[in-house]
């Protein structure tokens, strides 16, 4: 059983039950507007890919990574160091899947930050682990500035001040 | 050479306070990593007691026991990292260390002090 | 906070020997564990971290395994050196961090 800040998921034989009733399916919207069903069979047989991997009791398995779910709300800057001060990071999601696995276990609808700034050395979004976004993948709604980080909502990246305060994912 | 070097230690009467240092040389006390206290009573274990985060946040945690007593600062133009006890207890008689945690993935103290040893005692 | 309970606290043994320590945490820390050796009058020395990997500079005689909460610290072949005190310390990564170690295991010439 995978306890998370957000719902209870447990896999059994390829099949996810879990504690807040989903659909089997469910619906990601990809920030360019085009549609992927994900059903909760691929979110379990994903997370089963590295059974070797074994999380901390308040931190949640995924894919080999474990991920951490905030309950109160910091600053872009502040949600960083909390997440460094763990050995962890701020979230950097990879694909559709995760993005999916993330959105099942947010308990709210309103904006959490991610691994993602606009660096104005850089003029362009980078993780926090350095690498660029994919635009193929992501589309990041808003401004590219200064001054502006990333956070989640429903599926979509938005770019938000980053003094502005939210919930936040670390992840190892 | 990168070291952590105690000072501070004495006898101190039931009561008292004391106030530990601990100097890094080699490296500075600002990166992402914790400096801890750990000591140890007199033929007994390691006891965990509390830690600073050397990065700009400045965090800080401890042990619940050593929760109200214990107090860990850090002065980064010394580059020292402090432990403040108060109402000090005979059961504090211990040799007290500093350690470094890596600023790696992992959980680690790489780096120790030789130790600094408290009295409490009338 | 987590607790760390280590065991056996003493142990005879005699150089050549295989020995074996186990450490256990009161609540899932993952791999989040590290072993050290202590001699009398001296500051403990990083043996294993990350459960099983083992720090620059120690012999391949020492070895770590486990997990979730049950870990093992291995000695394959004793050496006299190797007489010492050795403790686990679990890390949280809780909203409250916390760094505890065991209570110690005491190895001893048979």
């Known amino acids: 059983l995978l306890v998370s800040q957000g719902v209870l998921l447990k896999c059994q034989k390829g099949s996810c039950s879990n504690a807040t009733q989903y659909e089997d399916t469910g619906d990601l919207k990809v920030n360019n507007g085009t549609r992927r069903n994900i059903s909760n069979k691929d979110l379990c047989a994903s997370r089963s890919a590295d059974q070797t991997v074994l999380c901390q009791s308040e931190w949640l398995k995924y894919q080999g990574k474990c991920y951490w779910f905030s309950n109160e709300m910091k600053s872009w800057s502040d949600s960083y160091v909390y997440c460094l001060e763990r050995k962890s990071h701020l979230l950097i999601i990879h694909d559709q899947l995760e993005m999916a696995f993330i959105q099942k276990n947010l308990r709210q609808l309103n904006y959490v930050w991610i691994g993602l700034n606009f660096t104005s050395l850089k003029m362009t979004w980078t993780w926090v682990d350095g690498s660029p976004i994919d635009s193929k993948i992501f589309f990041i709604k808003g401004p590219a500035k200064e001054n502006s980080c990333a956070a989640i909502k429903e599926s979509k990246i938005f770019s938000e001040t980053c003094s502005s305060v939210f919930k936040w994912i670390c992840q190892y | 050479q990168v070291q952590l070097v105690e000072s501070g230690g004495g006898v101190v009467q039931p009561g008292g306070s004391l106030r530990l240092s601990c100097a890094a040389s080699?490296?500075?006390?600002?990166?992402?990593?914790?400096i801890c206290w750990v000591r140890q009573a007199p033929g007994k274990g390691l006891e965990w007691i509390g830690c600073?985060?050397?990065?700009?946040?400045?965090?800080?945690c401890y042990a619940t026991w050593a929760k109200g007593r214990f107090t860990i600062s850090k002065d980064l133009s010394k580059n020292t990292v402090y432990l403040q006890m108060n109402s000090l207890r005979a059961e504090d008689t211990a040799v007290y260390y500093c350690a470094r945690d890596t600023g790696s993935g992992y959980w680690k103290y790489n780096i120790w002090g030789r130790g600094t040893l408290v009295t409490v005692s009338s | 906070d987590i607790q760390m309970t280590q065991s056996p606290s003493s142990v005879s043994a005699s150089v050549g020997d295989r020995v074996t320590i186990t450490c256990q945490a009161s609540q899932s820390i993952g791999r989040d564990l590290a072993w050290y050796q202590q001699k009398p009058g001296k500051a403990p020395k990083l043996l294993i971290y990350?459960?099983?990997i083992l720090e620059s500079g120690v012999p391949s005689r020492f070895s770590g395994s486990g997990s979730g909460t049950d870990f093992t610290l291995t000695i394959s072949s004793l050496q006299p050196e190797d007489f010492a005190t050795y403790y686990c310390q679990g890390a949280d990564r809780s909203s409250t961090p916390s760094w505890p170690f065991g209570q110690g295991t005491k190895v001893e010439i048979k």
């Open positions: 600073i985060y050397a990065g700009s946040s400045g965090s800080t």
């Open positions: 080699g490296f500075s006390f600002s990166g992402n990593y914790w």
């Open positions: 990350g459960a099983s």
